[in-house]
């Protein structure tokens, strides 16, 4: 514990001179800031050398007194310059100086690389009282040391805003090498050149770099940090680190894999998403991507019709992000699809192939060839066509639906009939004379109701009118046809 | 030993002036600052400013520029506190305080306190 | 200025008790705390400097720690003498500041 002196004994001794080595046991300081542990450190640096006060910083505070009193210059003694020492040993140090006590009003604190140290667990300053003199002692003190506390240390005392400053105090902490750079895991093309990065620094300096090779060292003689090792080429992967030596001893890095690039593994886990009567949205699981960035990856699309061909669409995309739609294909059809992906070294082989369906469409085409008449004496409309090609119906027939329009003098009417799939002829009522009736046809399938035809118009003249003919659906580019009886 | 003796007690009417003496004994004077502080009745402390007793260089808080000065009488040993244009609200007791070690600017010894009274 | 707040503001314990007073400074101040002790009627009377150090003819039972911004002080087995205010003052950087008081009385 510090304990305080009689405050106006004067038995300590004053700067100049071999202080505070020759302080004799009971002169305690008068004050001190306490160390906020108790820690002895390892390392004790007196605060002066014997010989000359330091003259490098002092200061003759611009002070006008009421009196015109001159002030002393003022210096902080000469203390050891440079401290070196290991990794987590304690450290202390300290300034010292001599202030008559004349100036009254003065401030000391501690500052590392121009920054001013704030925090007070590592200072102690003491103060030994004397009639004319306070000989003070600021100590700074370190208990495991690290590198972060390498750098340059200052007193400053502030008096009547003059600044004096202490020579600088250089701690300097030597440890084990510590890596600034460590080589990074690599992919690499077979066969092909490449380099590693290694770059360790003390203190203490040099640091010397040997590499290692699936643990075996690379270089016999080393190299000085930092190191570039290239290697001329690999055939297979391989695990490389780098061994920094210094005079404290060794530090070996991280061990880095170096991969050899190859094609991929083939995707898994190709599946359905989504099926319409002409698409079908898959997804897949990537395979190994072989060490290498995946580019794009191809769809591949057979019928699995047995009549088929066997022609193979393929459709090209991203590797990203898994998924694709495949377009164009025929309703309630049957397909098997694979999957591969490609990366800089080539494709991968195809995924297992899937069987997926698309399902029943609505018909992409109306019926061909309506054709509509009149039959006056049943009073009828009767309308005939062709069903579309099988091909193109997109699903099973169900029926067709039947559109017919009635206009006569600003009056427009239009009436739905369903009809069966089997035949392909209808009879309507006549609904109104002396019009126009207009006339559509559209297949139906489960899928739902496909284009109307063109239409097809016939005049249904008032009663008592013979002569009568057939309409039918033009050819493309005519005008629509009308039938007047 | 240290003492720091203070003048007695002063009424005084608004307007007025006041001067209040701390002679020092005990040790060398111009070796330490000293400080003036305020203790208004029922209140807390509140330091006024110092004086260099070196150089004669006064230091006033905020508070305390304008109608307060602070000066020194070496060769006794003496520091002074004068208040000019007294208000009510200057009743308080003032204390002088030696101020310790220089890099240390707390307080060692007090004088035994002025009651300064302001009242028409 | 640095703000002193100074907590509690009264406090009521009895012969024996330990008690602890803290100041709380608005900002850095390293360990450049002093505290006081003052009786009705009478000038202050010096008790720590420097945040942790007891003058010379003060008693044991008091103590006081901290540094940066948190200060107490902590009077142990206290004493039929020991009712009184007790007062923190931040000597780091003008202008000086002192907490507002704890009044200490017998309960």
């Known amino acids: 514990a510090i304990t305080e002196a009689r405050e106006e004994a004067k038995p300590y001794p004053l700067f100049p001179g071999p202080f505070p080595g020759s302080l004799q046991t009971d002169h305690t300081p008068l004050l001190s800031l306490p160390h906020a542990s108790g820690y002895q450190p390892a390392l004790m640096f007196s605060p002066t050398q014997p010989g000359r006060p330091h003259t490098g910083n002092v200061a003759i505070p611009q002070v006008t007194s009421v009196e015109s009193k001159p002030l002393p210059p003022l210096a902080f003694k000469h203390t050891v310059g440079h401290i070196i020492l290991s990794e987590h040993k304690g450290v202390k140090f300290n300034c010292s100086i001599s202030v008559p006590n004349i100036y009254q009003d003065t401030t000391i604190s501690w500052w590392k690389d121009g920054k001013e140290l704030l925090g007070a667990h590592h200072a102690i300053t003491q103060f030994y009282p004397d009639d004319e003199v306070t000989a003070i002692i600021a100590s700074f003190s370190i208990t495991s040391v690290q590198r972060s506390d390498n750098g340059s240390y200052i007193c400053k005392m502030k008096i009547n805003n003059e600044e004096i400053v202490s020579d600088p105090i250089y701690i300097e902490v030597q440890g084990l090498p510590h890596f600034t750079k460590q080589p990074e895991s690599m992919n690499v093309t077979r066969n092909t050149a490449f380099n590693l990065t290694c770059q360790a620094v003390g203190p203490p300096e040099p640091v010397n770099i040997f590499w290692v090779q699936n643990s075996s060292r690379v270089n016999e003689q080393p190299e000085k940090s930092p190191s570039v090792l290239t290697v001329p080429g690999l055939t297979e992967m391989a695990v490389f680190s780098c061994e920094a030596h210094n005079d404290k001893g060794l530090t070996v890095s991280k061990g880095v894999q170096i991969n050899i690039k190859a094609i991929p593994s083939p995707p898994t886990e190709v599946s359905i998403r989504n099926s319409t009567a002409h698409s079908i949205l898959i997804s897949w699981v990537p395979g190994f991507d072989g060490y290498s960035p995946f580019r794009n990856c191809s769809i591949q699309v057979k019928e699995a019709d047995p009549l088929s061909n066997g022609s193979v669409m393929i459709f090209n995309t991203s590797a990203l992000p898994h998924l694709y739609q495949i377009k164009q294909l025929q309703a309630l059809a049957n397909y098997s699809i694979g999957v591969s992906c490609m990366n800089e070294i080539g494709w991968s082989a195809v995924s297992p192939w899937i069987l997926a369906s698309t399902t029943e469409g609505a018909p992409s085409v109306a019926p061909l060839n309506v054709t509509v008449f009149l039959n006056e004496s049943s009073d009828n409309v009767d309308i005939r066509w062709m069903k579309p090609p099988t091909k193109q119906q997109d699903g099973e027939l169900v029926g067709y639906r039947i559109s017919h329009v009635w206009q006569s003098a600003g009056i427009s009417k239009e009436l739905l009939e369903e009809v069966g799939q089997n035949g392909s002829r209808a009879r309507i009522s006549v609904q109104v004379h002396n019009a126009t009736c207009t006339v559509r046809i559209a297949a139906v399938t489960r899928g739902g109701v496909g284009p109307f035809s063109d239409p097809v118009k016939i005049f249904i003249p008032a009663h008592g009118w013979v002569d009568y003919a057939p309409s039918s659906t033009p050819a493309p580019g005519n005008a629509d046809p009308v039938l007047i009886i | 030993q240290v003492q720091l003796v203070q003048s007695g007690s002063e009424l005084k009417k608004p307007g007025a002036s006041v001067k209040v003496s701390c002679k020092a004994s005990?040790?060398?004077?111009?070796?330490?600052?000293m400080n003036w502080v305020r203790q208004a009745p029922g209140q807390g402390l509140e330091w006024m400013g110092w004086?260099?007793?070196?150089?004669?260089?006064?230091t006033y808080a905020d508070d305390f520029k304008g109608r307060f000065v602070f000066s020194l009488d070496t060769s006794v040993s003496t520091a002074y506190l004068q208040i000019s244009s007294l208000k009510a609200e200057d009743t308080a007791v003032y204390y002088c305080?030696?101020?310790?070690?220089?890099?240390?600017?707390?307080?060692?010894?007090w004088g035994q306190g002025t009651l300064v009274t302001v009242s028409s | 200025d640095i703000q002193m707040t100074q907590s509690p503001s009264s406090l009521s314990a009895s012969v024996g008790d330990r008690v602890t007073i803290t100041c709380r400074a608005s900002?850095?101040?390293?360990?450049?705390v002093a505290w006081y002790q003052q009786k009705p009627g009478k000038a202050p009377k010096r008790l720590i400097y420097?945040?942790?150090n007891r003058h010379t003819g003060v008693p044991s039972r008091f103590s006081g720690s901290g540094s940066g911004t948190e200060f107490t002080l902590t009077i142990s087995n206290l004493q039929p003498e020991d009712f009184a205010t007790y007062y923190c003052?931040?000597?780091?950087?003008?202008?000086?500041?002192f907490g507002g008081g704890t009044k200490l009385e017998i309960k």
């Open positions: 305080a030696r101020k310790g070690v220089t890099a240390a600017r707390y307080f060692d010894y």
């Open positions: 005990g040790y060398t004077f111009t070796n330490h600052g």
């Open positions: 004086i260099n007793t070196y150089t004669g260089e006064p």
């Open positions: 900002q850095n101040v390293r360990t450049a």
């Open positions: 420097l945040a942790s």
């Open positions: 003052l931040q000597h780091w950087n003008y202008p000086l500041t």
